[in-house]
């Protein structure tokens, strides 16, 4: 069964800047990745970025840089300043859509310690 992993890290240089990394562990080819915060998309979450392998990347503040790391993983850097900046307990969710298999989603937040956290 495919799985999604989510890793949230706070940047040491900018304490209110976050890096979210997500990956898809499965055999299907990815058609779309949606990153949201505050919960899953459609369940109170707000979309931060949508990444399509062919048609490009769309991102919304406070997302600063969304990119593909591999064919099945992405990363997203969030701006640290402003009213819409995330806090330490913010939940981030990644949804990977693969055709014709379907969608898989996982959420994660900053781990209690300062070490990078991994949740699936």
């Amino acid at each position: 069964t495919p799985e999604v992993w989510v890793q949230v890290r706070m940047e040491a240089t900018e304490l209110s800047s976050f890096t979210i990394r997500c990956g898809f562990l499965g055999s299907g080819s990815i058609s779309l990745v949606t990153v949201s915060w505050g919960g899953p998309n459609g369940a109170g979450g707000t979309t931060l970025a949508v990444l399509h392998p062919e048609r490009g990347i769309r991102q919304w503040a406070p997302a600063r840089q969304a990119r593909w790391e591999t064919q099945s993983s992405i990363s997203l850097i969030l701006e640290g300043s402003g009213a819409s900046s995330p806090c330490a307990n913010t939940t981030f969710c990644c949804k990977f859509a693969s055709f014709p298999e379907g969608s898989w989603e996982a959420c994660g937040s900053l781990p209690p310690s300062s070490d990078p956290g991994l949740s699936a």
């Epitope: 080819s29 369940a43 048609r55 014709p100």
Partner: antibody, heavy 120, light 107 residues
Framework: DVKLVESGGGLVKLGGSLKLSCAAS????????MSWIRQTPEKRLELVAA????????YYLDTVKGRFTISRDNAKNTLYLQMSSLKSEDTALYYC?????????????WGQGTSVTVSS | SIVMTQTPKFLLVSAGDRVTITCKAS??????VAWYQQKPGQSPKLLMY???NHYTGVPDRFIGSGYGTDFTFTISTVQAEDLAVYFC?????????FGGGTKLEIK
């Protein structure tokens, strides 16, 4: 203007074969996932077979596995459904449809349908 | 496979009425639900995607809501041209599955 035009339907004997075609125009065919959906005489909709944009990944409804083959020719902008060992329950109106990644794989364009009647 | 149970099967309403159709998934499909309209003699047409997003040109009297397993589709003010069969569909997990349809008839 996006257009999907099905052809190849007709009256066929029990156990016979038929090949349906769907000619696509007005969009970059090779960038979209495609499906065959049938509507039974009782008006129920069933997704019979699906194929991803590059033709590598496919899906089949359990009841047609081993009898139907979905394929595509991206150079000819055409989707196919080869049907063999036809059964009476395959009698239906067959539609081809385009899936839109950005709409959660919803089918944003459908053809007008081609009728398949399996008789004994 | 995920079963989409759609109710009611038939609706007899007057123009101007508010109608609601429900769709219940046998397991969570998050927000991967679309709604289609099929007018007599025509192929299905996409109305809503991701539960509540209107497809291009779809009037805002059509309203979708829900998340997880329970979904509703509402026509706030029914018009004569809304005579059709309406289907819900999940695209969360293969195989994509449809509800049984709701036939809307105008008095």
């Amino acid at each position: 203007d996006v257009k999907l035009v099905e052809s190849g339907g007709g009256l066929v004997k029990l156990g016979g074969s038929l090949k349906l075609s769907c000619a696509a125009s007005g969009f970059t065919f090779s960038s979209y996932h495609m499906s065959w959906i049938r509507q039974t005489p009782e008006k129920r909709l069933e997704l019979v077979a699906a194929i991803n944009s590059n033709g590598i990944n496919t899906y089949y409804l359990d009841t047609v596995k081993g009898r139907f083959t979905i394929s595509r020719d991206n150079a000819k902008n055409t989707l196919y459904l080869q049907m063999s060992s036809l059964k009476s329950e395959d009698t239906a109106l067959y539609y081809c449809a385009r899936h839109e990644d950005y709409y959660g794989f919803a089918m944003d364009y459908w053809g007008q349908g081609t009728s398949v009647t399996v008789s004994s | 496979s995920i079963v989409m149970t759609q109710t009611p099967k038939f609706l007899l309403v007057s123009a101007g009425d508010r109608v609601t159709i429900t769709c219940k998934a046998s397991q969570s499909v998050t927000n991967d639900v679309a709604w289609y309209q099929q007018k007599p003699g025509q192929s299905p047409k996409l109305l809503m995607y991701y539960v509540s997003n209107h497809y291009t040109g779809v009037p805002d009297r059509f309203i979708g809501s829900g998340y997880g397993t329970d979904f509703t589709f509402t026509i706030s003010t029914v018009q004569a041209e809304d005579l059709a069969v309406y289907f819900c569909q999940q695209a969360y997990r293969s195989p994509w599955t449809f509800g049984g349809g709701t036939k809307l008839e105008i008095k």
